[in-house]
Interface confidence: medium
């Protein structure tokens, strides 16, 4: 025997109080799949959260963070304060990276500079709190008329969130 509720599409719920008629989700609620007996309350993006996508009858609202903050957790469940490049976030706020470490992003932790000598290369540009060391070519790699070394752009995956 087929469940009559299975005919109710997304955006509706199966109303037991009305002979299992499909009723539209009330305002500020949604159902993303068919056959649901209740609609879920829409997420509200308040305070440090801002609305990235409005709630509809078939999908929940999506939040991101106000400027100066970034998302943490699945579906941006938390907002965390940004820091400046060259810093990492601590309980007492943003703290400069310790000597020998750097952070080229507004989030995340400080991490160690490249050790050029391990690769047998000279230091072309010293590291800072916000930038990694840039290594030059190995001495044997230098040939007359060789073009100057361009510091590489910081490696970063586009749009990659901490999840």
């Amino acid at each position: 025997l087929q469940d009559p509720c299975s005919n109710c599409p997304a955006g509706t719920f199966c109303d037991n109080n009305r002979n299992q008629i499909c009723s539209p989700c009330p305002p500020n609620s949604f159902s993303s799949a068919g056959g649901q007996r209740t609609c879920d309350i829409c997420r509200q993006c308040k305070g440090v959260f801002r609305t990235r996508k409005e709630c509809s009858s078939t999908s929940n609202a999506e939040c991101d963070c106000t400027p100066g903050f970034h998302c943490l957790g699945a579906g941006c469940s938390m907002c965390e304060q940004d820091c400046k490049q060259g810093q990492e976030l601590t309980k007492k706020g943003c703290k400069d990276c310790c000597f020998g470490t750097f952070n080229d992003q507004k989030r995340g932790i400080c991490r160690p500079w490249t050790n050029c000598s391990l690769a047998g290369k000279p230091v072309l540009m010293n590291g800072t709190k916000a930038r990694d060391v840039v290594c030059g070519p190995r001495p044997a790699d230098l040939s007359p008329g060789a073009s100057s070394v361009t510091p590489p752009a910081p490696a970063r995956e586009p749009g990659h969130s901490p999840q």
Epitope: M78, T90, K91, C98, T101, I109, R111, P112, W113, E157
Partner: antibody, heavy 117, light 112 residues
């Protein structure tokens, strides 16, 4: 996406041993890789981490006892002069991404190293 | 280096019950704390990072809290599948403490 350890075997004390972590489905350009070990019946011990730029950091007890290096798809952990206390399962793990290298969300199954004379 | 002291070393509770595991750092680690679950013969599995952020796919029965030097993992509505050893792990960076990561000693959870 996966990481897989290899190279674990029975070695005699003092014989250098290199373990390899082979990654697939992602690029080491964007991730840090951590090595963790677990002696039989004991807890987890953090050994060290290698970052996207090749820089490494080691636990104080591990400095001088291990070295780490990498290429495009593998990370190598060398146990320079193993002792019986280095008998353990060795895990490699990928950080969530390079900025968030404080935690690891992709782990290998581990490779067993036994140091015995 | 900092030291992470995890208590208790083992705990037993009934299905449906609640278990609390504590982790104390020897200095302020600014919520850079993760919790892992490890079952026998398996690698660790990330549950929580940044002290309280639930990893994707982990049930909300697992809850992390704390700040400064004191952190807690609470497992509510215990299921038999939760029987495992749980570890905390911290990151630290400072001119005195140095730079690195460290695990707590682990807590074995038995579900009756």
């Amino acid at each position: 996406q996966s990481v897989e350890e290899s190279g674990g075997r029975l070695v005699t004390p003092g014989t250098p041993l290199t373990l390899t972590c082979t990654v697939s489905g992602f690029s080491l350009t964007y991730y840090a890789v951590t090595w963790v070990r677990q002696p039989p019946g004991k807890g987890l011990e953090w050994i060290g981490v290698i970052y996207d730029n090749g820089a490494t950091a080691f636990a104080t007890w591990a400095k001088g006892r291990f070295t780490m290096s990498k290429n495009s798809t593998t990370v190598a952990l060398k146990v320079t002069s193993p002792t019986t206390e280095d008998t353990a399962t060795y895990f490699c793990a990928r950080s969530a991404n390079n900025a968030w290298s404080t935690y690891s969300n992709l782990w290998g199954q581990g490779t067993l190293v036994t140091v015995s004379s | 280096d900092i030291v992470m002291t995890q208590t208790p070393s083992s705990v037993s509770a009934a299905v449906g019950g609640t278990v609390t595991i504590n982790c104390q750092a020897s200095e302020d680690i600014s919520s850079y704390l993760s919790w892992y679950q490890q079952k026998l013969g398996q690698p660790p599995k990330l549950l929580i990072y940044k002290a309280s952020t639930l990893e994707s796919g982990v049930p909300s029965r697992f809850k992390g809290s704390g700040s400064g030097t004191e952190y807690t993992l609470t497992i509510s509505d215990l299921e038999s599948d939760d029987a495992a050893t749980y570890y905390c792990q911290s990151y630290y960076s400072g001119s005195i403490s140095g730079y690195g990561f460290v695990f707590g000693g682990g807590t074995g959870v038995v579900v009756k």
